[in-house]
């Protein structure tokens, strides 16, 4: 059954050091505020579906997202915002203002990251929203835009 | 006694995978350079006291702090600084200059983070200082300002 | 031999929670785009050689680098770039543009970080390139410039 108190290997494969992780790069073509990811990244104990990472094992997860922006400055300043969502709810955001001088320059690079430490249950979804997704640099720097999670602890 | 060489569960609950973690959000009202935190966050094997995270289990910790600033630009540039302190000593800092154009604009968002990997003993305190605490955005983005630690390894 | 299926302590010392880590600060004097590091930092299960961290145990590693820049603004904007290299190949970059107003100001602080989650084999090298290494602030903030890795999981 589910009990393995006598079986060493079974015990060692269980909880306190069970591992789950994901490391996905952003999809090449973005067309909406909810980002899509390349599902051919690293996925272990986590599923990818429709822009979501879907948790398979409950526990405390470290979640980190990093995005590389390339902004063609308009005449006004631009607020770049990265939102981390758990089950479609915004749990954490990072904002930075670029092009603040109000000058039309060739381009401005900006790197933005956000992390979260949270308990996630089975089937919890993790996703990322970016209003200004058009500024995410998927052409020059496609590998820089990543969403990563790893299970830190699945014991209470 | 302290020896549990024959007891599987006892061994498994011991060192190499003992876990400790914290994830606290900044207090709503800040009035000094040493930041205060909401003690109703995630605390496991770590205590919170007077603006400090207090370590309960010795080991190698990953410490990360992230702050969201909202600056009403004056006529000059502003240096935002985040200091991570271990036992009251500044161990690591992150600085960024905003409002560099010297123009009075409506507002400028800036996100700043800092991490540290360090051996911490029992009763070690972890805290954060910010000279320009008045710019930390605790109203629009209260959840973005966090201090987190987790024990990576408690073995030598 | 290599088999320890009957030996508890042997099993517990094995894989799923084998730990390796490094946390190195940048060298005081930098003279090329490939950064050098102070080898008297924290090194455990990882070697340092000629600007490279050299992996000793295969597995999934979390790699993070953070740099503090201090830029004396010229008449034009400056792109700061941090490259993470695995076996001399650029695996991840972070870019940010400073001095975008085009004004000669006294100085501008900028903090830049980059992380990576990747499977690394024995003897894999991890290094960092920065084109604008002259702007890395090694004098005022020597401790802010760090390269850190830690083994998350060495099981498949």
């Amino acid at each position: 059954g589910g009990n393995c108190s006598e079986d060493l290997l079974c015990i060692l494969k269980r909880a306190p050091f069970k591992k789950s992780w994901a490391y996905l790069q952003v999809a090449k073509h973005l067309n909406k505020t909810k980002l899509s990811w390349n599902k051919d990244g690293i996925l272990h104990g986590v599923r990818y579906q429709d822009g979501n990472l879907v948790i398979q094992f409950p526990g405390l997860y470290f979640i980190i997202c990093q995005l590389q922006f390339l902004v063609q400055c308009p005449n006004n300043s631009v607020d770049l915002k990265l939102e981390l969502l758990i089950n479609k709810h915004i749990k954490k955001q990072a904002l930075v203002t670029v092009c603040e001088s109000g000058m039309q320059t060739k381009h401005v690079y900006q790197n933005l990251s956000q992390f979260l430490l949270d308990y996630l249950q089975v089937n919890t979804t993790v996703s990322v929203n970016v209003d200004t997704f058009q500024y995410i640099d998927t052409s020059t720097f496609p590998l820089e835009n990543v969403l990563s999670v790893f299970l830190y602890s699945n014991s209470d | 006694g302290g020896n549990c060489s024959e007891d599987l569960l006892c061994i498994l609950k011991r060192a190499p995978f003992k876990k400790s973690w914290a994830y606290l959000q900044v207090a709503k009202h800040l009035n000094k350079t040493k930041l205060s935190w909401n003690k109703d966050g995630i605390l496991h094997g770590v205590r919170y006291q007077d603006g400090n995270l207090v370590i309960q289990f010795p080991g190698l910790y990953f410490i990360i702090c992230q702050l969201q600033f909202l600056v009403q630009c004056p006529n000059n540039s502003v240096d935002l600084k985040l200091e991570l302190l271990i036992n009251k000593h500044i161990k690591k800092q992150a600085l960024v200059t905003v409002c560099e154009s010297g123009m009075q604009t409506k507002h400028v968002y800036q996100n700043l983070s800092q991490f540290l990997l360090d051996y911490l003993q029992v009763n070690t305190t972890v805290s954060v200082n910010v000279d320009t605490f008045q710019y930390i955005d605790t109203s629009t983005f209260p959840l973005e300002n966090v201090l987190s630690v987790f024990l990576y390894s408690n073995s030598d | 031999g290599g088999n320890c299926s009957e030996d508890l302590l042997c099993i517990l010392k094995r894989a799923p929670f084998k730990k390796s880590w490094a946390y190195l600060q940048v060298a005081k004097h930098l003279n090329k785009t490939k950064l050098s590091w102070n080898k008297d930092g924290i090194l455990h299960g990882v070697r340092y050689q000629d600007g490279n961290l050299v992996i000793q145990f295969p597995g999934l590693y979390f790699i993070i680098c953070q740099l503090q820049f201090l830029v004396q603004c010229p008449n034009n904007s400056v792109d700061l770039k941090l490259e993470l290299l695995i076996n001399k190949h650029i695996k991840k970059q972070a870019l940010v543009t400073v001095c975008e107003s085009g004004m000669q100001t006294k100085h501008v602080y900028q903090n830049l970080s980059q992380f990576l989650l990747d499977y690394l084999q024995v003897n894999t090298t991890v290094s960092v390139n920065v084109d604008t290494f002259q702007y890395i602030d090694t004098s005022t903030f020597p401790l802010e410039n760090v390269l850190s890795v830690f083994l998350y999981s060495n099981s498949d």
Epitope: - | I90, Q93, Q121 | -
Partner: antibody, heavy 125, light 107 residues
Framework: EVQLVESGGGLVQPGGSLRLSCAVS????????MSWVRQAPGKGLEWVGR??????????DYAAPVKGRFIISRDDSKDTLYLQMNSLKTEDTAIYYC????????????????WGKGTTVTVSS | DIQMTQSPSSLSASVGDRVTITCRAS??????LAWYQQKPGKITHLLVY???TLQSGVPSRFSGSGSGTDFTLTINSLQPEDVATYYC?????????FGGGTKVEIK
């Protein structure tokens, strides 16, 4: 109660050698970073060098005037710190203090509040 | 190397006076500064660490302040037992340099 007791001082000729010891009690010595500080007659305090704990690699740092001549070592099994002084010069004449290093507070929660009474080294022909 | 410049080198004040000793570092040492008290023939004692934190057991008339390059040790109400030489020390980077010392006497 934390105690540091230095020994091994004495009179030695220029070019000679001497080994100082420091017996430590009341702290977990293996965790401690340890320093040597000296004070020449009528002068101020001068830091000589330090040794880190094994966790931090057990590495040593030295002041310029003694680098290459002095060696700091430790024996964690005996809770003892050593200072091997070679090629001694007249300007090395001083009281030598064994102390817990300031970085102990950053790393281990006890500060450099513990000094020994010192042992006198006289270098003279 | 970081130079620590302490001033004055000596001072004489009356019991009850407020005494201020300054220490300047040749470069930024954050708050990695300690103040020590040394009396002839006695063990040297720590007064303040991390620039402003009073060591336990040290009378509250002693206080430290400063960060970066400029630091101050203040004795709010000088007492006869405070006659001693006071040293500041940088422990931000090696070598862990001391200031030259300030000898405090009673008028």
């Amino acid at each position: 109660e934390v105690q540091l007791v230095e020994s091994g001082g004495g009179l030695v000729q220029p070019g000679g050698s001497l080994r100082l010891s420091c017996a430590v009690s009341g702290i977990t010595f293996s965790n401690a970073w340890m320093s040597w500080v000296r004070q020449a007659p009528g002068k101020g305090l001068e830091w000589v060098g330090r040794i880190k704990s094994k966790t931090y690699g057990g590495t040593t740092d030295y002041a310029a005037p003694v680098k290459g001549r002095f060696i700091i070592s430790r024996d964690d099994s005996k809770d003892t710190l050593y200072l091997q002084m070679n090629s001694l010069k007249t300007e090395d004449t001083a009281i030598y203090y064994c102390t817990t290093d300031p970085w102990n507070y950053v790393n281990y929660n006890y500060f450099m509040d513990v000094w020994g009474k010192g042992t006198t080294v006289t270098v003279s022909s | 190397d970081i130079q620590m410049t302490q001033s004055p080198s000596s001072l004489s004040a009356s019991v009850g006076d407020r005494v201020t000793i300054t220490c300047r570092a040749s470069q930024d040492i954050r708050n990695y500064l300690a103040w020590y008290q040394q009396k002839p023939g006695k063990i040297t004692h720590l007064l303040v660490y991390a620039a402003s934190t009073l060591q336990s057991g040290v009378p509250s008339r002693f206080s430290g302040s400063g960060s970066g390059t400029d630091f101050t040790l203040t004795i709010n109400s000088l007492q006869p037992e405070d006659v001693a030489t006071y040293y500041c020390q940088n422990y931000f980077s090696v070598p862990l340099t001391f200031g030259g010392g300030t000898k405090v006497e009673i008028k």
